[in-house]
């Protein structure tokens, strides 16, 4: 969380913005707001990048201007007009790629004053895992299977009744690069499991932290997976 | 209501350049909300998208059609245009000018009614 | 480029028919897909966009569902103005991209 001020006059105005982390190929957000300011026609937004000549987006006068926009942000921002009124001034980013990573400035001026707050933005890739008792093999074993991730991420499995277990022996992980040759496909076994007993199955980068349940009965297989954003808020 | 209507001739010789212009009427081509696209259409197939253009001149190619292609615009008469050089047989299509419906979207909600340019000599 | 894959490239149907077109890119495009209705002569007209989004006077028989890589256009109750020729269009990446089309005719 990062709060801006600025000084018009004798005006401040307060902006906060929240680090936050785009999935490549994906739609991002990078959230921004400040003080209301219900004449519409007033306010200014202007979403600037670190190292970037041109501006990222501009909204005046109740409408996109996006007459300096670099064109690496070509087609790809927008913000929530319809909410620029109650302080909103979030930019909406399509398509997120590897090198929108960043330093972004949201730089606000209404008729109350003007203040701008900075953001990290961090990208990469990253999704749910899914797990699946492989009958394929010679022993009973579980398969661990995400479809995009970047940065290369760590996997580690962990147990309920085994707690504090090292099953780096006993599992086997790879790494498949994708079509597009950024993002990489994980895919984890773990062999000779034991019926009633939760695995999980951990997947984690700088950017995120994910994690697949899976407890297995003699009468039924139950899933359960989260994903969480590192240092985002 | 916005209307799009292209113009410009409907044959071209082999070699040379083809040259259309749209006209918007009914709203300012410089109100910032949209690009301005153009796309074609071969006889009986497909449509393609040539390339864009933003009220203050940026613009963005296919990149098929790149070295051949200039879009431009002129806001005094509220008009875009697209010029295509070294025109082929190949390029015998119908052409649309059409509007992309805000500056993330990138659907075409509104279009002219095409004009067929025909490359022969 | 994106390439767009419509199926089928033709279907034969009857009035109040149910009609499920699909559209396949090769790579995920999130919800960034269009759809049009184009009949002989005239410019396409935009259905539905962000995969699922009903452009405004467009009748409630179309709807468009999908994400990612696999999209379809359903018109639930074929009308007779409804004979006309149905493209997809990618809005994620340039340069945009059109599927093929798929003709849907009278049986």
């Known amino acids: 969380l990062i709060i801006g001020f600025g000084i018009s006059g004798k005006h401040f105005i307060t902006v906060t913005t929240f680090t936050s982390a785009g999935n490549i190929g994906e739609d991002g957000t990078l959230s921004c707001t400040f003080e209301p300011d219900i004449k519409l026609n007033g306010i200014v937004i202007q979403w600037l990048k670190e190292g970037i000549k041109g501006l990222v987006h501009e909204f005046k006068e109740g409408k996109d201007d996006l007459s300096q926009q670099h064109e690496m942000f070509r087609g790809r921002t927008a913000v929530f007009a319809d909410q620029v009124v109650v302080g909103n001034a979030s930019l909406r980013l399509k398509n997120v790629q590897l090198t929108d990573a960043g330093t972004y400035t949201c730089y606000i001026r209404t008729s109350k004053g003007k203040g701008n707050a900075n953001l990290e933005y961090k990208t990469g890739a990253f999704s749910m895992p899914e797990i699946n008792v492989d009958y394929n093999a010679s022993s009973e074993s579980l398969r661990c299977e995400a479809p995009r991730w970047f940065p290369q991420p760590t996997v580690a499995w962990a147990s309920q009744v085994d707690q504090g277990a090292n099953f780096s022996e006993v599992s086997n992980t790879s790494f498949e690069l994708n079509s597009e040759n950024v993002t990489m496909k994980v895919v984890s076994v773990l062999y000779n499991v034991t019926i009633n007993n939760t695995y999980s199955c951990m997947i984690e980068n700088d950017i995120a932290k994910a994690t697949g349940d899976i407890k297995v009965t003699d009468s039924e297989v139950k899933r359960r997976s989260q994903l969480q954003l590192l240092n985002s808020g | 209501q916005v209307q799009l209507q292209e113009s410009g001739p409907g044959l071209v010789k082999p070699s040379q350049t083809l040259s259309l212009t749209c006209t918007v009427s009914g709203g300012s081509i410089s109100s910032g909300g949209y690009y301005w696209s153009w796309i074609r259409q071969h006889p009986g197939k497909g449509l393609e998208w040539i390339g864009n253009i933003y009220y203050s001149g940026s613009t963005y190619y296919n990149p098929s059609l790149k070295s051949r292609v200039t879009i431009s615009v002129d806001t005094s008469k509220n008009q875009f245009s697209l010029k295509l050089s070294s025109v082929t047989a190949a390029d015998t299509a119908v052409y649309y000018c059409?509007?992309?419906?805000?500056?993330?979207?990138?659907?075409?909600?509104?279009w002219g009614r095409g004009t067929l340019v025909t490359v022969s000599s | 480029d994106i390439q767009m894959t419509q199926s089928p490239s033709s279907v034969s149907a009857s009035v109040g028919d149910r009609v499920t077109i699909t559209c396949r890119a090769s790579?995920?495009?999130?919800?960034?897909l269009a759809w049009y209705q184009q009949k002989p002569g005239k410019a396409p007209k935009l259905l539905i966009y962000?995969?699922?989004s009903l452009q405004s006077g467009v009748p409630s028989r179309f709807s468009g569902s999908g994400s990612g890589t696999d999209f379809t256009l359903t018109i639930s109750s074929l009308q007779p103005e409804d004979f006309a020729t149905y493209y997809c269009?990618?809005?994620?990446?340039?340069?945009?991209?059109f599927g093929g089309g798929t003709k849907v005719e009278i049986k």
């Open positions: 962000a995969a699922s």
């Open positions: 059409a509007r992309e419906s805000s500056t993330i979207s990138a659907d075409f909600d509104l």
């Open positions: 790579q995920g495009i999130s919800r960034w």
């Open positions: 269009q990618q809005a994620h990446t340039f340069p945009y991209t």
